[in-house]
Amino acid sequence: AVNGTSQFTCFYNSRANISCVWSQDGALQDTSCQVHAWPDRRRWNQTCELLPVSQASWACNLILGAPDSQKLTTVDIVTLRVLCREGVRWRVMAIQDFKPFENLRLMAPISLQVVHVETHRCNISWEISQASHYFERHLEFEARTLSPGHTWEEAPLLTLKQKQEWICLETLTPDTQYEFQVRVKPLQGEFTTWSPWSQPLAFRTKPAALGKDT
């Protein structure tokens, strides 16, 4: 088990949460492991228990404070350690000097709603959740629309290269059911990645007026 390939990946949500995944080929499912966070310039330490998410991977969330509190800054470094129980003692499996603002993954956008819908277009808005005020407007979004008979993977990506929390979808088919998703990413951070996709928003375009081409 010890010689299997290991991987430890963590992301900061920009406010008060560091989410981590630990994987190790050949490790036993009932292995007891935890992540320990040890900041370089703060008085707190934090630990979370790694819980199994698949055959050889475990995940946990380091909750650093209230969801919207700004617990870390761009100058912070947090040493993260994976510790696994071996008999009566804990064994260090991995260590990382984690730079939070180089490893960002925001929460999925929330509160998606249809602002206005017509036969061929639909205006949708959303909000970002637990995003640091440090970003100001330095965020980008990707959106996708699920059309009937297609999969999410086939949906073309629409890119919004600025902090724009709305979109006007065009060239839609009248009287048709669609679903819409959006995700967000800060421009900052060498290892920053996209947030999860938002919960899908279902909407239906208006039917075309009889005898009219709208």
Epitope: V2, N3, G4, T5, S6, Q7, F8, Q24, W38, D40, I77, T79, R91, V92, M93, A94, I95, Q96, D97, K99, E102, F191
Partner: nanobody, 123 residues
Framework: QVQLQESGGGLVQAGDSLRLSCVVS????????MGWFRQPPGKEREFVAL????????HYTDSVEGRFTISRDSAKNTVYLQMNSLKPEDTAVYTC????????????????SGQGTQVIVSA
Amino acid sequence: QVQLQESGGGLVQAGDSLRLSCVVSGRDFSGYTMGWFRQPPGKEREFVALITWSTGRVHYTDSVEGRFTISRDSAKNTVYLQMNSLKPEDTAVYTCAAGRVGYTTNLHSYDYSGQGTQVIVSA
């Protein structure tokens, strides 16, 4: 490209000291973790020590704790392994590794590694 070059190995007597060096080049290693592994003749490769580049936090395997010291010199882009009170069982090829994460489990989970330097401790 990224390179890690070990040096400082050699033949010594039991109880002597050696200092291994690992010079890293080819990228900014701040935020990385540097590890030393060793492979004794006819045995599996094993973890020895690691140090986080930014904060200088260290970790050792039990068998070298108190005898070996890992350190880094950011100005020289070099990681050192000071080995005191050497024993015949410390005989091995010592390899330096670098990664965004430092693993005690194995060398091949690191992003980069060197070629190794031979240490022989005679009784």
